[in-house]
Interface confidence: low
């Protein structure tokens, strides 16, 4: 049996196999040792008994999408049946005081691998034996503590495989310089030690994507916007746009990145090297926001230009972009791309990313201010309470509700929250009456809201003892 017989049905073409060489990976035409690593596929009845106490689930994740040339990292995490965990020695043990369907276990071990792995029977004195090998026969690497690593992970993609000895969680990084653009499939098979052989315990697959487009996300934030995720914002207040480039392997760390904005409101293009920008829309309506990101990234070098014909001199390729210690040059995709040739062959290529959104601009409450506070005289039965009127003004649209949050002087511990509907005239002037129990300093957060906006103002007030001579003070606003 060969690796491709064991590890999946996806058979890349000869072209794909030739042009997708992954550094450190091996061809799945290699032979698989079926004696040490028995082969089961889905539906085999032995899967049910391959792990004591239930099935092990393998979770495969990646930081896809990956810009071609960058590294993509795959992580596999094993999820054991309830009440089981891996201990510091790599053995699988029952968690203390944890009850599963079988009740509490008297035996602390699910699998006590230490017991047999320290038995050197059959070894040649170097810690190596005929069974401490991967499915292709390569010996296990002897890292410190390798005996405590009891799981064998076999990664398979693009007609190649990578073997790794590990614990209940492993990570593998792959450089994508030679990977064809588009979605690809990664499959992982996990084996556990079983005496002097191995038993499959889990199989998992996941699609990853290699792209020549810079993966771009934009977050948008605006003060007073009630719902930041609905792409509806307020007129006459700045919106902060923050560009997030998905580059987990820091491939673009040394690249100059340009951001080109079109806000869709006839304010023209805005080009910046900063990943954040503020923009204020001054009209209501629907606008198409467009962003283009450009980065000079490490990339393949173009072929040298042909020698010029005597009759027609050929223009030389630009050599203006900076040198870069690049990874192995790889395919750059099918689009016409700007290439720069550099004498030391560390070439760069301009990569692009795009973001588009349709945003809606509406009226909203732009600002709220407390312009006056008045201590209302209380009848005698409530000597400990103070009644205070807040006179509030606002700008923008007319609010439909008011909330006050009364808290301690640090504004952290809420003591009282009251919300109520309001009916406000065009002048947006209203009085909010609130009760304070006892003297002292209070933080007051006052918000005015409507369907799309929520405007806030805060103040610290000092409520005096119930001595009529003591004035009410606004500590700060």
């Amino acid at each position: 049996k060969r690796f491709h017989d064991v590890l999946g049905n996806e058979r890349p073409s000869a072209y794909m196999r030739e042009h997708n060489q992954l550094n450190g990976w091996s061809s799945d035409e290699n032979d698989w040792n079926e004696k040490l690593y028995p082969v089961w596929k889905r539906g085999d009845m032995r899967w049910k008994n391959s792990w004591k106490g239930g099935r092990v689930q393998a979770v495969l994740t990646s930081d896809s999408p990956a810009l071609v040339g960058s590294n993509i990292t795959f992580a596999v995490n094993l999820i054991f049946p309830r009440c089981q965990k891996e201990d510091a020695n790599g053995n699988i043990v029952y968690e203390k005081n944890c009850r599963n369907e079988a009740g509490l276990s008297a035996d602390p071990y699910v699998y006590n691998w230490t017991a047999w792995s320290e038995d050197s029977d059959g070894e040649n004195g170097t810690g190596q034996s005929h069974h401490n090998v991967f499915p292709d026969g390569k010996p296990f690497p002897h890292h410190p503590g390798w005996r405590r690593w009891n799981f064998i992970y076999v990664f398979h993609t693009l007609g190649q495989y990578f073997q790794k000895l590990g614990r209940c969680s492993v990570r593998v990084s792959v450089n994508t310089a030679n990977v064809t653009l588009g979605p690809q499939l990664m499959e992982v098979t996990v084996y556990r030690r079983h005496g002097r052989a191995y038993v499959p315990i889990a199989q998992v697959k996941d699609v990853y994507v290699v792209t020549d487009q810079i993966p771009v996300f934009v977050t948008m934030f605006q003060k007073n916007d009630r719902n930041s995720s609905d792409e509806t914002f307020l007129k006459d207040l700045p919106i902060m746009f923050d560009v997030l480039i998905h580059d987990p392997s820091h491939f673009l760390n040394y690249s100059t990145i340009n951001y080109k904005w079109s806000f869709g409101d006839n304010t023209g293009l805005f080009v910046s090297t900063n990943h954040t920008v503020n923009h204020t829309y001054v009209l209501n309506g629907t606008f198409s926001l467009n962003l283009t990101v450009k980065a000079a990234a490490p990339g393949p070098c173009p072929p040298p230009p042909p020698p010029p014909r005597p009759s027609k001199p050929t223009p030389s390729l630009a050599t203006t972009l900076k040198s870069y210690d690049s990874n192995t040059p790889g395919p750059a995709g099918d689009n016409p791309l700007e290439l720069s040739r550099i004498p030391d062959e560390n070439c760069q290529i301009n990569r692009y990313g795009h973001f588009q959104a349709t945003i809606t601009i509406v009226e909203g409450i732009l600002e709220v201010n407390i312009i006056q506070m008045t201590d209302v005289l209380m009848p005698v039965p409530w000597p400990e309470s103070s009644l205070i009127d807040f006179v509030v003004t606002c700008q923008g649209s007319i609010p439909t509700e008011v909330c006050t949050i009364i808290s301690d002087p640090t504004c952290e511990i809420t003591q009282n929250t009251v919300c109520s509907p309001v009916d406000v005239d065009e002048m947006c002037l209203l009085t909010v009456r609130r009760t304070f129990n006892g003297s002292g300093t209070y933080c007051v957060n006052l918000t005015l809201g409507d369907d799309t906006s929520l405007a806030l103002t805060s103040t610290l007030i000092s409520v005096p003892d119930r001595d009529p001579a003591s004035p009410l003070r606004m500590a700060n606003s």
Partner: antibody, heavy 122, light 107 residues
């Protein structure tokens, strides 16, 4: 040489029971993959009935026989069984004992017995 | 349940000819398909598993292939002993299901 020999078939009335046996030889019965029963009604196609894992701990049935048929095995005797209760006329068929392919997951059948006829009729 | 639609139900061919029998799965079975040959009064014999892997002892004139959920059994240079009924079976998931069969006769 792998051999599977069925026995226990015959004519039975609806609602009655019958127990089929399959004696295996030529391979290590307990260490190989599962065993199964597959049936074939007269002049009809093949229909998988039930499977059992090598240790006997896992059993699988087609919906139409669930609750009526029981598959089991005795590894010491190298024999698997099919206990058929509440038999119906539509259970009339030749019942084949079959071995699941021994190397892996695959629930196809690499060895078959000669078959035994079960007729359910009043 | 996964349905296996086998065609044709019967066919007649001459010695030395090549014949193709097809099986269509109602959903993806990931190459988990077997082909069996059954002669009158006999039990089925495994020919092909995993869509295209030849069982030990089966002549190389039998071959299997797939395209999506469509699976094919091809018999090259037909011999007299190939007259039989052929069944496909999906071994991807329970309940395991067979095609209705194709009866191959020699002219």
């Amino acid at each position: 040489e792998v051999q599977l020999v069925e026995s226990g078939g015959g004519l039975v009335q609806p609602g009655r029971s019958l127990k089929l046996s399959c004696a295996a030889s030529g391979f290590t019965f307990s260490s190989k993959s599962g065993m199964a029963w597959v049936r074939q009604a007269p002049t009809k196609g093949l229909e998988w009935v039930a499977s059992i894992s090598n240790g006997g701990g896992d059993t699988y049935y087609r919906d139409s026989v669930k609750g009526r048929f029981t598959i089991s095995r005795d590894n010491a005797k190298n024999t698997q069984y099919l206990q058929m209760d509440s038999l119906r006329p539509e259970d009339t068929a030749t019942y084949y004992c079959a071995r699941h392919r021994d190397y892996g997951y695959d629930a196809y059948f690499d060895y078959w017995g000669q078959g035994v006829m079960v007729t359910v009729s009043s | 349940d996964i349905q296996m639609t086998q065609s044709p139900a019967s066919l007649s061919a001459s010695l030395g000819e090549t014949v193709t029998i097809e099986c269509l799965a109602s959903e993806d079975i990931y190459s988990s398909l077997a082909w069996y040959q059954q002669k009158p009064g006999k039990s089925p014999q495994l020919l092909i598993y995993d869509a295209s892997s030849l069982q030990d002892g089966v002549p190389s004139r039998f071959s299997g292939s797939e395209s999506g959920t469509q699976y094919s059994l091809e018999i090259n240079s037909l011999q007299s002993e190939d007259a039989a009924t052929y069944f496909c079976q999906q071994h991807h998931d329970y309940p395991y299901t067979f095609g209705a069969g194709t009866k191959l006769e020699l002219k």
